[in-house]
């Protein structure tokens, strides 16, 4: 089962998507793969059903700077 | 509340492109999910394709060929492009709103244009 | 033949409980993707029913209501009245296919 979350649509997924990723950008669909053309964007995922944090960060431009 | 009102020739010819408008009131379209959706004669719905503001589309696999869906900020508007029409494309055509507070469902339509494909 | 297979026509007397079902796959509703409902009057545009599974908005009477579970969902109306008779149509999104997909649609008839 999908993980419990919330979902997130309009203008309060992008401020929460500039939050998440804060100076490091985002994406709305990460490019496709040649084994997943048919990858799907952060609206479907985080709009049309429940989302966490994990899987908006997946989303952010750059990876987070480990410490 | 947001109000929407398709707009665009009722008569089309085989093989011309069909273009629609959308003008949205009482709302801003940099807020919102825009859709547009069809219904054949007597059939059910079909989506077609939705748009965010920032340039994020998506388009059904079977029209994603023929389909262009645009934004005009300054008029408030969003557009349809459907090229090579037939026969088969003949439908009531809605524009509709996701406005993110119903977890994407589209919550406002409009009332429907009828587009007839005919010579 | 929709992706989301609805039957193509109930009907119940006034007053009466029906169930309107909604079956999808392990890529739409069993994935985990909201079911939305939409009510369609005789020559009228859609009009959303229910959300997210079982949310009404504003204004629709609470003698709608949705449930999902696994791969299908299903809408229920009671106290059936006249004004009920219309189209409804099921919508969700479909991974396999990334894009959004309605039910082929069920024609509910109130009798009498």
């Known amino acids: 089962a999908y993980g419990p979350g919330e979902t997130l649509c309009g203008g309060e997924l992008v401020d929460t998507l500039q939050f998440v990723c804060s100076d490091r950008g985002f994406y709305f669909s990460r490019p496709s793969s040649r084994a997943n053309r048919r990858s799907r964007g952060i609206v479907e995922e985080c709009c049309f059903r429940s989302c966490d944090l994990a899987l908006l960060e997946t989303y952010c431009a750059t990876p987070a700077k480990s410490e | 509340q947001v109000q929407l009102q398709e707009s665009g020739p009722g008569l089309v010819k085989p093989s011309e492109t069909l273009s629609l408008t959308c003008t949205v009131s009482g709302g801003s379209i940099s807020s919102y999910y825009w859709s547009w959706i069809r219904q054949p004669p007597g059939k059910g719905l079909e989506w077609i394709g939705y748009f965010f503001y920032s340039g994020y589309t998506n388009y059904n696999p079977s029209l994603k060929s023929r389909v262009t869906i645009s934004v005009d900020t300054s008029k408030n508007q969003f557009s349809l492009k459907l090229s090579s029409v037939t026969a088969a494309d003949t439908a009531v055509y809605y524009c509709?709103?996701?406005?993110?507070?119903?977890?994407?469902?589209?919550?406002?339509w409009g009332q429907g244009t009828t587009v007839t494909v005919s010579s | 033949q929709s992706v989301l297979t609805q039957p193509p026509s109930v009907s119940g007397a006034p007053g009466q409980r029906v169930t309107i079902s909604c079956t999808g796959s392990?890529?739409?509703?069993?994935?985990?993707?909201?079911v939305h409902w939409y009510q369609q009057l005789p020559g009228t545009a859609p009009k959303l029913l229910i959300y997210?599974?079982?949310n009404r908005p504003s204004g629709v009477p609470d003698r709608f209501s949705g449930s999902k579970s696994g791969t299908s969902a299903s809408l229920a109306i009671t106290g059936l009245q006249a004004d009920d008779e219309a189209d409804y149509y099921c919508?969700?999104?479909?991974?396999?296919?990334?894009?959004?997909?309605f039910g082929g649609g069920t024609k509910l008839t109130v009798l009498g």
């Open positions: 919508q969700s999104f479909d991974s396999s296919l990334s894009g959004s997909v």
């Open positions: 392990s890529s739409n509703i069993g994935a985990g993707y909201d």
């Open positions: 997210g599974n079982n």
């Open positions: 509709a709103c996701i406005t993110g507070t119903t977890k994407g469902g589209m919550d406002v």
